[in-house]
């Protein structure tokens, strides 16, 4: 169950998709990736207040137990619900190759 | 790529499966669940240091960018990699029913 999308903490403060620009050097990829030289990394960042974008029953349980035992049970966490693929031109033993990575760019976010 | 399982922070401090005992009242289920009265909730808790149990390429990127921009990019988060089903006896309009929930109890954990 994907729960409420209204953020009680104010606009943009809850779990959502953010874009962070990163170079190959930033990512530690400079020695094995030729292209792209810069990646617009989409990732999930933000708070997960009670029932906000709860991914499933487990997330709902986590919210309840966090309220009861905040020192033991952490709040749900903002993570990718799905991904966009990304194609890299990478170095290989024989030269270069195109490689698709299916789990690189977040497409959608939820709390779990 | 599921990366290293060695925790550099010390035994038990990194992302792993924990069990938290919770009553139906704790979970807010007392009005719709008859059984079990108490649930051994398995959940993923712990830190996600560099490359520890990295779920995928996205988690590896997140680690790299968190190192560079800790105020902007959070560290990867400890979440379920898979779930165990759980059967609840729940109240219905006509009486009671058995219902299996596939996404209630964490079975295995990773960092993302």
């Amino acid at each position: 169950a994907r729960n409420g999308d209204h953020c009680p903490l104010g606009p943009g403060r809850c779990c959502r998709l953010h874009t962070v620009r990163a170079s190959l050097e930033d990512l530690g990829w400079a020695d094995w990736v030729l292209s792209p030289r810069e990646v617009q990394v989409t990732m999930c960042i933000g708070a997960c207040p009670s029932q906000f974008r709860a991914a499933n029953m487990h997330a709902q349980i986590k919210t309840s137990l966090h309220r009861l035992k905040p020192d033991t049970v952490p709040a749900p966490c903002c993570v990718p619900a799905s991904y966009n693929p990304m194609v890299l031109i990478q170095k290989t033993d024989t030269g270069v190759s195109l490689q698709t990575y299916d789990d690189l760019l977040a497409k959608d976010c939820h709390c779990i | 790529a599921r990366n290293g399982d060695h925790c550099p922070l010390g035994p038990g401090r990194c992302c792993r499966l924990h069990t938290v005992r919770a009553s139906l009242e704790d979970l807010g289920w007392a009005d719709w669940v008859l059984s079990p009265r108490e649930v051994q909730v398995t959940m993923c808790i712990g830190a996600c240091p560099s490359q520890f149990r990295a779920a995928n390429m996205h988690a590896q990127i997140k680690t790299s960018l968190h190192r560079l921009k800790p105020d902007t990019v959070p560290a990867p988060c400890c979440v379920p990699a898979s779930y165990n089903p759980m059967v609840l006896i729940q109240k219905t309009d006509t009486g009671v029913s058995l219902q299996t929930y596939d996404d209630l109890l964490a079975k295995d954990c990773h960092c993302i």
């Epitope: 030729l34 292209s35 792209p36 030289r37 966009n84 693929p85 990304m86 194609v87 890299l88 031109i89 290989t92 033993d93 024989t94 030269g95 270069v96 190759s97 195109l98 490689q99 698709t100 760019l105 | -």
Partner: antibody, heavy 121, light 110 residues
Framework: EVQLLESGGGLVQPGGSLRLSCAVS????????MTWVRQAPGKGLEWIGI???????YYASWAKGRFTISRDNSKNTVYLQMNSLRAEDTAVYFC???????????????WGQGTLVTVSS | DIVMTQSPATLSVSPGERATLSCQAS??????LAWFQQKPGQPPRLLIY???TLASGIPARFSGSGSGTEFTLTISSLQSEDFAVYFC????????????FGQGTKVEIK
């Protein structure tokens, strides 16, 4: 000697299908990406698509849906399946090793001689 | 879709002169660009890859430059065997990958 040899071209009616082959020798196909390119008579080069060493395929937007690239590493052969052919698909079809914009180690310019496909009724 | 635009369509140059060919990409393709020479009845011949690296066996009078969206092929002193058609090829990668050739520049004897 490293070689690429295209075959399977010929005359085909509009709406018909054809499968082109690119047989390679002198290297192990499994380690390389392979590209298909075509050239209509008297016209420029047109990029069709690539099959990567891992088997992923990438196509020009105009080729998606009608053209399919595949490979059989055990036969050291790459294929181009062309469906719903039209007169404007008449061209010489080339296969080439690599992604072309970066060089593989060793030979930098491995192209076949091409095979002519004529679509006409 | 990525579009590669070459200019000029035809370049008339005297032997021994310098020739400068341009190629523009519709997307930022970094250095994912190659230059090819083609003569009638032959497959293309790779001259430059990675925008500026000379392919093996290619004379040093050929050079490439540029990155992003603007690229140039320079032939410092044209020889008789250099009169041919030249094509640029760009490959754009992000969520998928797609390549495109420019329409070609014919270098002819002035």
């Amino acid at each position: 000697e490293v070689q690429l040899l295209e075959s399977g071209g010929g005359l085909v009616q509009p709406g018909g299908s054809l499968r082109l082959s690119c047989a390679v020798s002198g290297f192990s196909l499994s380690s390389y990406d392979m590209t298909w390119v075509r050239q209509a008579p008297g016209k420029g080069l047109e990029w069709i698509g690539i099959i990567s060493s891992s088997g992923n395929t990438y196509y020009a937007s105009w080729a998606k849906g009608r053209f399919t690239i595949s490979r059989d590493n055990s036969k050291n052969t790459v294929y181009l399946q062309m469906n719903s052919l039209r007169a404007e698909d008449t061209a010489v079809y080339f296969c080439a090793r690599g992604i072309l914009v970066y060089a593989d180690y060793g030979d930098h310019n491995l192209w076949g001689q091409g095979t002519l496909v004529t679509v006409s009724s | 879709d990525i579009v590669m635009t070459q200019s000029p369509a035809t370049l008339s140059v005297s032997p021994g002169e310098r020739a400068t060919l341009s190629c523009q990409a519709s997307e930022d393709i970094y250095t994912n660009l190659a230059w090819f020479q083609q003569k009638p009845g032959q497959p293309p011949r790779l001259l430059i890859y990675a925008a500026s690296t000379l392919a093996s066996g290619i004379p040093a009078r050929f050079s490439g430059s540029g990155s992003g969206t603007e690229f140039t092929l320079t032939i410092s002193s044209l020889q008789s065997e250099d009169f041919a058609v030249y094509f640029c090829l760009g490959v754009y990668t992000y969520i998928s990958a797609e390549g495109a050739f420019g329409q070609g520049t014919k270098v002819e004897i002035k």
